[in-house]
């Protein structure tokens, strides 16, 4: 077996020049000819110097998995997927994200303690006594108002989700 140089690849008992990123081998070199390289067609790529007969298939980012394309596929690099807005990564695969999930929605009676990021879900916290949050989107719970003195009866005690007026 030949031990080829860094910029060559083995073909039988000979060495041929590699094709550059974005190209694949259309025809191996001969005695009088160099390697014939052909550009990758749309939807395919090769990221390194190579002796490949076909370009590789670009991956596609599946919105159903909460993914969006963070780097488009080019002939020299595969696509990269990130999380769609409002989603965080649930399957981190090295420097790729394989699947994302929508942020949790805080319930009424809770506040958003920490907003979601690409790697972490929204963190919700129950409102402390005497405060309320009617829709769960607030960063701070609101203080309930006391009933006016001319009302004969109080409509009911306040809850962390709703206030009585």
């Amino acid at each position: 077996l030949p031990s080829c140089k860094e910029d060559e690849y083995p073909v039988g008992s000979e060495c041929c020049p590699k094709c550059g990123p974005g190209f694949h081998v259309r025809q191996a070199c001969g005695e009088q000819t160099g390697t014939v390289c052909e550009p990758c067609s749309p939807g395919t790529y090769i990221a390194h110097f190579n002796g490949l007969s076909k370009c590789l298939q670009c991956q596609m980012c599946d919105p159903a998995m909460g993914l969006r394309t963070s780097r488009n596929c080019s002939t020299t690099a595969n696509a990269l997927c990130g999380c769609s807005p409002g989603h965080f990564c649930i399957i981190q695969d090295g420097d790729h994200c394989a699947a994302c999930r929508a942020y949790a929605t805080s319930s009424p009676g809770q506040r958003v303690q920490k907003g979601g990021t690409e790697s972490q879900d929204t963190l919700c916290q129950n409102c402390p006594p005497g405060t309320f949050s009617s829709n769960g989107t607030l960063e701070e719970c609101q203080h309930g108002t006391k009933c006016s003195k001319w009302l004969v009866t109080e409509a009911g005690p306040g809850t962390s989700s709703f206030r009585w007026v």
Partner: antibody, heavy 119, light 106 residues
Framework: QIQLVQSGPELKKPGETVKISCKAS????????MNWVKQAPGKGLKWMGW????????TYADAFKGRFAFSLETSASTAYLQINNLKNEDTATYFC????????????WGQGTSVTVSS | QIVLTQSPAILSASPGEKVTMTCSAS?????MHWYQRKSGTSPKRWIY???KLASGVPARFSGSGSGTSYSLTISSMEAEDAATYYC?????????FGAGTKLELK
Amino acid sequence: QIQLVQSGPELKKPGETVKISCKASGYILTNYGMNWVKQAPGKGLKWMGWINTYTGEPTYADAFKGRFAFSLETSASTAYLQINNLKNEDTATYFCARGYGNHWYFDYWGQGTSVTVSS
Amino acid sequence: QIVLTQSPAILSASPGEKVTMTCSASSSVSYMHWYQRKSGTSPKRWIYDTSKLASGVPARFSGSGSGTSYSLTISSMEAEDAATYYCQQWTSDPLTFGAGTKLELK
């Protein structure tokens, strides 16, 4: 979660045909290339080739040109490996494996399908 | 084709011991990938692009190398690391695997 589930073991006679299935779930089959790998008893892993699941175009390693065929049924999220005119040396476990990343490593593998060829 | 030679073929290590296995390519390759396989199961991605750990792989594993010489190292052997490890290249066709290094617990 992402899974590649292969069809069950096969016992065949020389000259017959076998068709192995690989059903993808948890992702869209056509979003990633699919590879096929052979492991004969007591031997190492041997790459058979791959199929571009978007275009349907197969690529075969030299040792697997002729009697071997990769195909797809995208509506069923399934890739297939068919081996025609079976020979004793085709006795092996066959794996499907998804190509992933910038330099294509195999991130998910099927559980393997054992094919035994014996008269 | 590029032949990948893994050494040693069999390696025995005690818990806590540092382990190194190598993968030598017959011609220069751009990247090396590694898989772990336990008996009766399919291979698992383990290290990709020479040195990046796949999801769920313990930090005691590392990969390095360039050109024709690559290695996988475990800083401190644990019982669950006993398995066969395969290297793989696809710088040129055909894609090839090494014959594997079987790592046993001493």
